[in-house]
């Protein structure tokens, strides 16, 4: 299923630019001598702008009225609306969606769809790959785990390169690279399974360049609400692309009568998209930090940022919870179509597959469910949080916790239903996935609330790395390994192919429950950590004496 870039990156795609923009706004506030300044702009892809006063914060879940913070007895500082209208204020130009910039954002979003389409096409033809190469569940799980591991390692490297070199060239080269590798991998002979594993690792490197750099370009193309909208579209490409990956895998192999053709669709589209990026995406300038921003950068070292994040309990617990989501989505996304095919073999509504194409229908339905639940989950989560914020300050982590615990119940029920009713299993998948995906936007908001703007890029990068490392980097392989282990200790038969994979996948609801516990732990510290972050922003926003006006 979709990995947690959606959660962390939806919050923090283009975080560097976001921080820069906030610093610029603070600088304007300092120049105006307006006392203190809030964080006026909308933050990237729906993360909450941390403000100092009793202002409104725009989030994916809606706007939230904050109580004034500061020492007792001090009045809340003027909100954004007031400050922006102050004398000498630089009025931001209305975000008009230029046709060129709109086209660029559309192409970048299309590229993101292709990234995930390519990633999950393999899951869509997993049964065929197992048959063709004669590999067990463990070997099949290795494909996704190697991909995620290389992706995880390569992402920070491309983050570094993206800050220093031509971004659209890196983007295009990344797309051309993974397209060429995926296309080549469709010709690997039966006896060279290790080459397919290697190719997935290389594809992970290519795709890491895209996921890291593309949001920063969008961040520079747009401002305020338009940027929030564009980044939302960019990240909603994740469930769409993932679902289309399953659908493409199953449909193409059925149409062509050979699963190899499924691996040749995304490369062709990738080459086209890569070319369009070179032609249509403008060479945008990165946001430059102003004097105050430079001072902030100089004052806090990377090591100090890391220490501060590790001491931030809300951040640590929400990151662990995010890892649990990532673990479950990675494992379920890889194995559920195959599990359901095996369920149908046991129910005698399908035959055990010996010669591909295999299990196309399961990938097709699962793909459609993934697409829809991705959208529905984000909308449901955002709506639920907006409503719950009227009742409690701890709404964000509590909604996530409820979503996780509810999801665990329905994930458990998948394995009960699959024994007798495939339709019942699909219903459980639908509800379980919706609840699991409901915390995407909210997790992003939590990070924005409890981490100060100058640390957000580091926080997002660390959370993304952690969620992969503890989550979907190992879970597909681990599930395959456990499945094979169970079969070795029992017996190898059609029934045990089904049961062993089901028992292995039962690890997922337990991890999801653990994730729910982490969100409950986040709820314990959320209010105090948010207050601390807001207090730090207030202190940072105060113009130092050395700044000339």
């Amino acid at each position: 299923m979709m990995c947690l870039e959606c959660a962390s990156a939806a919050a923090g795609g283009a975080e560097e630019e976001e921080a820069d923009a906030e610093r610029r706004r603070r600088r304007r506030g300092a120049q105006r001598g307006a006392g203190g300044s809030g964080c006026c702009g909308a933050r990237g892809a729906g993360g909450a702008g941390v403000s100092a006063a009793g202002d409104e914060v725009q989030t994916l879940s809606g706007s939230v009225r904050r109580a004034p913070t500061g020492p007792p007895g001090t009045p809340g500082t003027p909100g954004c609306a007031a400050t922006a209208k102050g004398p000498g204020a630089q009025q931001p130009k209305p975000a008009s969606l230029g046709r060129g910039r709109g086209a660029a954002a559309a192409i970048l979003s299309l590229g993101n769809v292709l990234n995930y389409l390519d990633r999950y096409t393999v899951a869509g033809v997993l049964l065929d790959i197992q048959q063709h190469f004669g590999v067990k569940d463990r070997g099949a799980g290795l494909l996704q785990s190697v991909f995620i591991c290389s992706f995880m390692v390569a992402a920070p490297i491309f983050g570094y390169l993206g800050d220093r070199f031509n971004r659209k060239v890196i983007l295009s080269c990344g797309i051309f690279f993974w397209s060429a590798v995926t296309f080549s991998s469709s010709f690997i002979p039966q006896q060279y399974f290790w080459l397919l594993v290697l190719s997935r690792g290389l594809v992970g490197i290519g795709e890491a360049s895209y996921s890291t750099i593309a949001p920063t370009i969008i961040g520079d193309l747009f401002t305020k609400n338009t940027r929030t909208l564009m980044l939302s579209v960019f990240y909603f490409a994740i469930p769409l692309g993932s679902g289309l990956g399953y659908i493409t895998g199953s449909s193409v192999k059925q149409a062509a009568g050979d699963w190899h053709w499924a691996l040749r669709v995304s490369p062709v589209l990738g080459m086209i998209t890569g070319t369009l990026i070179l032609i249509l995406v403008p060479a945008t300038k990165r946001g430059h930090a102003d004097q105050l921003g430079d001072q902030l950068k100089a004052r806090t070292s990377w090591l100090r940022d890391m220490k501060a994040l590790i001491r931030n309990r809300s951040y640590v617990f929400s990151s662990l919870a995010t890892s649990a989501v990532s673990f479950a989505t990675g494992a379920l996304g890889m194995w559920i179509p195959l599990y359901l095919h095996r369920a149908q073999v046991v129910q005698k509504t399908a035959e055990t597959c010996n010669s591909p194409p295999c299990g196309a229908k399961d990938s097709l339905i699962f793909g459609a469910i993934t697409c829809f639940t991705g959208f529905l989950g984000v909308v449901t989560g955002a709506g639920a949080t907006r409503w719950c914020r009227l009742k409690t300050q701890r709404a964000d982590p509590l909604v996530c916790a409820v979503g996780m615990l509810g999801s665990a119940i329905f994930i458990c029920l998948i394995f009960v239903a699959a024994k007798s009713s495939i339709v019942g299993a699909y219903i459980c998948i639908f509800v379980g996935e919706t609840l699991l995906f409901s915390n995407w936007a909210i997790t992003a908001d939590i990070l924005m609330y409890v981490v100060i703007p100058t640390r957000r890029a580091t926080a997002v990068a660390l959370q993304s790395f952690t969620s992969h490392l503890l989550g979907d980097a190992g879970s597909p392989y681990l599930i395959g390994f456990i499945s094979d282990l169970i079969r070795q200790s029992t017996k190898d038969s059609p029934l045990w192919e089904f049961l062993s994979l089901g028992y292995a996948l039962m690890l997922c609801p337990f991890v999801v429950v653990l994730g729910g516990m982490f969100f409950l732990a986040t709820a314990l510290f959320f209010v105090s950590d948010r207050a601390r972050a807001e207090q730090q922003v207030n202190q940072l926003a105060m113009p130092p004496a050395s700044v000339k006006v």
Partner: antibody
């Protein structure tokens, strides 16, 4: 449904070997598990073992270890059983069958009569 | 090995109900499944699957065949018996390796 076509009658001398084939045809969705079953008037139906044609993995009933060797050729969708060191006790009808669902024998070959006599 | 015990022979009248029993030496229930299956074998032919998972009718099998039971005791019922049903009926368990068959129940018409 899959059709399992077995080779013809086998006459063999004690101490020799025979190799019986079982070719799968019909639906492309065929069983990964081809099993072999022995039937004699005295002993009834006895399970020999199976071969997973996808992975090549085999399982043998303890009673038939050393007696039967199961192999498969994926390209021709054919499974084979070789019976070695034949004795008159090995005279029986040998069926191949596809193992599926909750581990039952769904489709059966027509059977091969093996007669061992000097 | 799990031993399956069947009654050796049964001779019902045409149109009557025939009940064939099969008892396992230990429970064949596992993970919500009753891993007992029934086959019909006519002289000179290969066996044919009738019932799987104790009570589920195999495809193409007439509804007059039904299966019941759980744990160790299982029953195959033919109601009403027709002349075409003259055959030997075998039960088979798939809970433990090696899979085992009952000795068979021969159905003859009275």
């Amino acid at each position: 449904q899959v059709q399992l076509q077995q080779s013809g009658v086998e006459l063999a001398k004690p101490g020799s070997s025979v190799k019986i084939s079982c070719k799968a045809s019909g639906n492309t969705f065929t069983s990964n598990y081809i099993t072999w079953i022995k039937q004699t008037p005295g002993q009834g139906l006895e399970y020999i073992g199976y071969i997973n044609t996808g992975s090549g993995k085999t399982y043998y009933n303890e009673k038939f270890k050393g007696k039967a060797t199961l192999t498969a050729d994926k390209s021709s969708s054919t499974a084979f059983m070789q019976l070695s060191s034949l004795t008159p006790d090995d005279s029986a009808v040998y069926f191949c069958a596809s193992l599926t669902g909750v581990d039952y024998f769904d489709d059966w070959g027509q059977g091969v009569m093996v007669t061992v006599s000097s | 090995d799990i031993v399956l015990t069947q009654s050796p022979a049964l001779a019902p009248s045409l149109g009557q109900r025939a009940t064939i029993s099969c008892r396992a030496s230990q429970s064949v229930r596992m993970s919500g499944y009753n891993l007992m299956h029934w086959y019909q074998q006519k002289p000179g032919q290969q066996p044919k699957l009738l019932i799987y998972d104790a009570s589920k009718l195999a495809s193409g099998i007439p509804a007059r065949f039904s299966g019941s039971g759980s744990g160790t005791d299982f029953t195959l019922t033919i109601d009403p018996v027709q002349s075409d049903d003259i055959a030997t009926y075998y039960c088979q368990q798939s809970k433990d390796d090696p899979y085992t068959f009952g000795a068979g129940t021969k159905l003859e018409l009275r």
